[in-house]
Each structure stands twice: as C-alpha cells, then as structure tokens.
C-alpha cells in the first residue's frame, strides 16, 4: 500500500524532520507550511490550522521559503555614485553597484558602502591590473618598445610600430613615426583596452602580460558575474 500523504499541519514521526518547504512549529508541535518567496507568515499554524501567508508590502521582500512574521526591508535607494542593478521586488532586495568607472572601495555586508572613481594610467604608463568591482587600477611604466599616449583606466602599453625608416623614434608615451608612407607592419592598429569591470558582482581579472615584441592577441577576459548569495530569511 502507498504511504499516506500527510497534509499540514501534522505531527511528525518521532525522530523525523518536516518535509521540504515545511517547518516545525515549537508551539503547535506540528509540521507546518512555509510561506513562498514574496510572502511572510501572517498567522502562525496551530494544531488544527496551517500557516496563513500574506504578500510582502511595498519596499519589503522575502527571498526564500520562510515563516518570518514580517518581510525584510529593502535597502535604501541607490546613492548618486551607484546604479541600481536589481530592483526591490517582493522576492528580492535592491542591489546597488558602483557606476561605470568607479569601484567599491568600502564594502558592507550586502552591496557597497562607498564607491570611488578608478585611477587612470597616464601617458607613458599602461594598465598592469585592471580595476574590478572591488579593486582599483594598477599602472606600470611602458617597457622599451611599447607606449601609451592616453590617460585611461583600460589602455595597456602597446608596441611601437615598426618602420622601414624611422622619422621620430617612439618612447614610452609616443608611437614611432615613420618616414615612409606606411610602416612595414603596424603593430599598433588602435588603442588596446582591457575589459572594463561590469558593474554587477565582484569579478576576478588577471593581469595582461606585457607585450615584448609582438602584441598579445589573447586577452584574459573577466569571468562572468557570480550568482548572488542567498538571502537571510531561512530555508
């Protein structure tokens, strides 16, 4: 015979636990239904009646199956140095991240307390380590044979173009100038940018190796955003 399905509320067998999406109510000493994300427990269960759930009010949320008496308050509106990357809904908190060109200098438990603008590398210097959502840009001097002529948080040092006849030799902040109408091969077709940090979650970018004689074509791209951490409403 198939096992009889118990409907909530029910008294669990001694030593057993309640099923998924149920919780044990200490007062009623019964297994009772949890409320779904976006809801909270309006009335707790008794021996004869199950949990009564109600929708979260505006600006409040529950992210998980729960039996909390009140929904959690969404965080305050994003400040001027941040952008809202996830809106406050009944099922999720608002997420604020630093705007493009900024990084989270001071973090808090959830989100960012204070954003700061990314440093930029000046001419003669290139990006050694790009900024991430939680770390600043690191610059390095352009090695002999390479240059950067920009003030940028993304540009790396690029190799000088190779000339048949050099009119003006390149230096750390300027490309070589050729006398012939065109160089034998242009090593620097355009500014090479490191990927900008995408303002969602922290990412791990690796430093791009310094090009020695030939430009690198395989840049290490940042990994995609990691999934958000689970909320704290209990499962």
């Amino acid at each position: 015979l198939p096992a009889q399905v118990a409907f909530t509320p029910y008294a669990p067998e001694p030593g057993s636990t309640c099923r998924l999406r149920e919780y044990y109510d200490q007062t009623a000493q019964m297994c009772c239904s949890k409320c779904s994300p976006g809801q909270h427990a309006k009335v707790f269960c008794t021996k004869t009646s199950d949990t009564v759930c109600d929708s979260c009010e505006d600006s409040t949320y529950t992210q998980l199956w729960n039996w909390v008496p009140e929904c959690l308050s969404c965080g305050s509106r994003c400040s001027s140095d941040q952008v809202e990357t996830q809106a406050c809904t009944r099922e999720q908190n608002r997420i604020c991240t630093c705007r493009p060109g900024w990084y989270c200098a001071l973090s808090k438990q959830e989100g960012c307390r204070l954003c700061a603008p990314l440093r930029k590398c000046r001419p003669g210097f290139g990006v050694a380590r790009p900024g991430t959502e939680t770390s600043d840009v690191v610059c390095k001097p352009c090695a002999p044979g390479t240059f950067s002529n920009t003030t940028s948080s993304t540009d790396i040092c690029r190799p000088h173009q190779i000339c048949n006849v050099v009119a003006i030799p390149g230096n750390a902040s300027m490309d070589a100038v050729c006398t012939s109408t065109s160089p034998t091969r242009s090593m620097a077709p355009g500014a090479v940018h490191l990927p900008q940090p995408v303002s969602t979650r922290s990412q791990h970018t690796q430093p791009t190796p310094e090009p020695s004689t030939a430009p690198s074509t395989s840049f290490l791209l940042p990994m995609g955003p990691s999934p958000p951490a689970e909320g704290s409403t209990g499962d």
Partner: antibody, heavy 125, light 109 residues
C-alpha cells in the same frame, strides 16, 4: 604645464545668479574629473560638485539643494558652475580642482593635486 | 562621513614637531589626504592614501593612521610650515557631510 584657471567671479546682488568658468590647459581634459571647492573668508574648504567628462557623471554636496549646476564644454576644455539664488553665505573664493597625477604614473581622482588660483564671489544686499 | 580635525590651532618652535589629528565619523580605511594652505593661495596636496607623500613634499612630513583616526606629523618645523592644514576623505559624493576637516592653523614661533 598643467593648469586650471577660474574666472567669472565678482559682486552679485542677493538672490542673483553667476556663472563661473574653469579653463584647463596642459591636461587630458576629457579624462580628468574636475571639482569645485569653495572657501568663505577666514573659513575652511567646502566641496561643492564634480564632473567626469568621460563618464558624463556629476554629483553635488547635499547643501547645494539644486541651486548650482556643473557643466562642461569639451571643445573649450572648460568646466562651468552656474549658481542661482545666491545668498550672503555663498560669499567665498571658488576654486576648481582636479585629481592627483602621481610620479608613479597614475591619475587619482579621489584627491586634489591640481588647483586653480581661485575666483572671489561676493554676494551683497 | 564627517571629518573632525584637532586642534583648531597649534604653535610650534622652529625645529620642533607638530602633530595634527583627523577623525572620520566612520571607517574610511586609508582613503585620506592632507593639504597645506597659505593665505591667498590654493591648497597644496601633501599626503594621499593616508601615508603616501605627494611629489615634491619633503620627507619630514609624515601621514599615518587608518580607519577613523589619522595623524599628520611635521618634524623639524620651519618658518615656511606656518599655514593651515586640512584633511580630506576620498569620497566626495552627495552622501558626504563634510569632505574636508575644519582645518588646523599652525603658528611657527
């Protein structure tokens, strides 16, 4: 030579308006953030607003309350501060300032390494 | 974030040492700068990131501290050090109550 020069200050009547200019030279203007900072006679420094030309972002101190607007003319390498509803409390020397260009190769917008000489604004009744 | 500087004024003898304190109302890690301002001039950056010396600043000027407590120390004080000194946190946005401290006047005797 990296330089910032303010202009447009002067005497203005209570409730009046004034537009200050900050002309930049010798810097990569489109990549540098510019802030306005003021100093009332005998008082301390007070940050007003900033603008980042390459990101087009602006922000203001809370006390500004919509009375001031920061803007820029990229072609002229100039940042402006439009001030309205001026009161006696706005009497100050107004400085424009930009980030710190370090010898180790970076430009850090968090700190003010380059300042203009300032322009005096006097609000009289 | 609110920045509070102490003392408001301090006097020092030539060759002596001056210590100026700056307190942040909340943790700002090491995102702090110090400036020197003389009458009729704009401020000059002395220290950034709490302890790094700006270009051209003599090594007798020292910045220290992190979190909420910061100190500027000038040793071997010279007449030229007579000025007002300001601290500044690196987060100038509309969320900041005061970006700069109130200033400390240094008088050299």
């Amino acid at each position: 030579q990296e330089q910032l020069v303010e202009s447009g200050g002067g005497l203005v009547t209570l409730g009046g308006s004034l537009k200050l200019s900050c002309k930049a030279s010798g810097i990569d203007f489109s990549s540098y953030g510019i802030s306005w900072v003021r100093q009332a006679p005998g008082k301390g420094l007070e940050w007003i607003a900033y603008i980042y030309p390459d990101y087009g972002s602006t922000d203001y101190a809370t006390w500004v309350n919509g009375r001031f607007t920061i803007s820029l003319d990229n072609a002229q390498n100039t940042v402006f501060l439009q001030m309205t509803s001026l009161t006696a409390a706005d009497t100050a020397t107004y400085f424009c300032a930009s980030g710190y260009a370090s010898s180790s190769g970076y430009y850090d917008p968090k700190y003010f390494g380059l300042w203009g000489p300032g322009t005096l604004v006097t609000v009289s009744s | 974030i609110k920045m509070t500087q102490t003392p408001a004024s301090v006097s020092a003898a030539v060759g002596g040492t001056v210590t100026i304190n700056c307190r942040a109302s909340e943790d700002i890690e090491s995102y702090l700068a110090w400036y020197q301002q003389k009458p009729g001039q704009p401020p000059k950056l002395l220290i950034y990131d709490a302890s790094d010396l700006a270009s051209g600043v003599p090594s007798r000027v020292k910045g220290s501290g992190s979190g909420t407590e910061f100190t500027l120390t000038i040793s071997g004080v010279r007449c030229d050090d007579a000025a007002t000194y300001y601290c500044q946190h690196g987060f100038y946005t509309s969320r900041s109550d005061s970006v700069f401290g109130g200033g400390t006047e240094v008088v050299v005797k």
